[in-house]
Interface confidence: medium
């Protein structure tokens, strides 16, 4: 098992609204959870973009997913990942 | 389901600062949302905000967000509540409390300390 | 914010009762994950709340089959198949559905 490394990011989207997106990378199995959480509370599928999950080149997998909030809320937005029982929790970078 | 307790009761003036502990044992303490709540004397619940342990991520009632600024020691697996400029108002029980999303309920205030009175006296 | 409404103010039964409590909420209460987070909560006299019902219906661990919720929207319903002498206190309706979280008056279930 390689556990993944996660990575999160922000982009200016329309105004008032930024864009943060959570990549998880350089992981085996292929298997992995990777979800947007409010308040700790999942966010429904309709509201995520997700990208496949890919063979990085070197034996290991690579994602993301992304959701639109409301610039100053970025608090209460956690990414959250589960691969092979282990899991952690992930802050929007301010 | 593991346990919170609370720091004791508190007498404190006017204009001063009071700093509430709750200490927890049982769980994985940076996995957990930490609530804190107030209840005046005879009345109902108001929630205060919440800190992610695993993070220091905070969520504040904006009515508090003045008033209330949540911290978390996870060497010690205790959060804090400091509660500044404090008036006969804020004469309250303040409870902690635990969120359960990582078991199968998704509930929002799943286990409670005990509790800690606060009176604001001159 | 969210007003929740909770009728009666007080409710005297008689031990063996149904109990019918009532909460209503000034805005519908669907999480944006689509589900509600509407919970009710037991206090007894010098004892911190305890949690009964999560998202509407579903019984926490350790509570008794008597205690059930239901409703959808703006109105919920908690009910006490038959009341027991450790049911009596003053419970409250709760939604965790929009910041800022907030809770209903409370209803006081009491000895009639």
């Known amino acids: 098992t390689v556990p993944p490394m996660v990575n999160v990011t922000r982009s200016e989207a329309s105004e008032g609204n930024i864009t943060v997106t959570c990549r998880a990378s350089s992981f085996y199995p292929r298997n992995i959870i990777l979800t947007w959480r409010q308040d700790g509370v999942s966010l429904s599928h309709d509201t995520q973009q997700w990208g496949d999950v890919l063979p990085d080149g070197n034996g290991t997998y690579q994602t993301w997913v992304a959701t639109r909030i409301c610039r100053g809320e970025e608090a209460r937005f956690t990414c959250y990942m589960e691969h092979s029982g282990n899991h952690s929790t992930h802050p929007v970078p301010s | 389901q593991g346990q919170m307790q609370q720091s004791g009761a508190e007498l404190v003036k006017p204009g001063a600062s009071v700093k509430l502990s709750c200490k927890t044992s049982?769980?994985?303490?940076?996995?957990?949302?930490i609530s804190w709540l107030k209840q005046k004397p005879g009345q109902s619940l108001e929630w205060i905000a919440w800190?992610?342990?695993?993070?220091?991520?905070?969520s504040y009632n904006q009515k508090f967000t003045a008033k209330a600024q949540l911290t978390v020691d996870t060497s010690s697996s205790t959060a804090y509540m400091q509660f500044s400029s404090l008036t006969t108002e804020d004469s309250a029980i303040y409870y902690c409390?635990?969120?359960?999303?990582?078991?199968?309920?998704?509930?929002?205030?799943?286990?409670w300390g005990q509790g800690t009175l606060v009176t604001v006296s001159a | 914010d969210v007003l929740m409404t909770q009728t009666p103010l007080s409710l005297p039964v008689s031990l063996g009762d149904q109990a019918s409590l009532s909460c209503r909420s000034s805005?519908?209460?669907?999480?944006?994950?689509?589900?509600?987070?509407l919970e009710w909560y037991l206090q007894k006299p010098g004892q911190s709340p305890k949690l009964l019902i999560y998202?509407?219906?579903n019984r926490f661990s350790g509570v008794p089959d008597r205690f059930s919720g239901s409703g959808s929207g703006t109105d919920f319903t908690l009910k006490i198949s038959r009341v027991e002498a450790e049911d009596l206190g003053v419970y409250y309706c709760f939604q965790g559905s929009h910041v800022p979280w907030t809770f209903g008056g409370g209803t006081k279930v009491e000895i009639k």
């Open positions: 049982g769980f994985t303490f940076s996995d957990n949302y």
């Open positions: 409390a635990r969120h359960d999303y990582y078991g199968t309920s998704g509930a929002w205030f799943a286990y």
């Open positions: 998202k509407v219906s």
């Open positions: 800190i992610y342990a695993g993070t220091g991520g905070t």
């Open positions: 805005q519908n209460i669907v999480h944006i994950n689509g589900n509600t987070y």
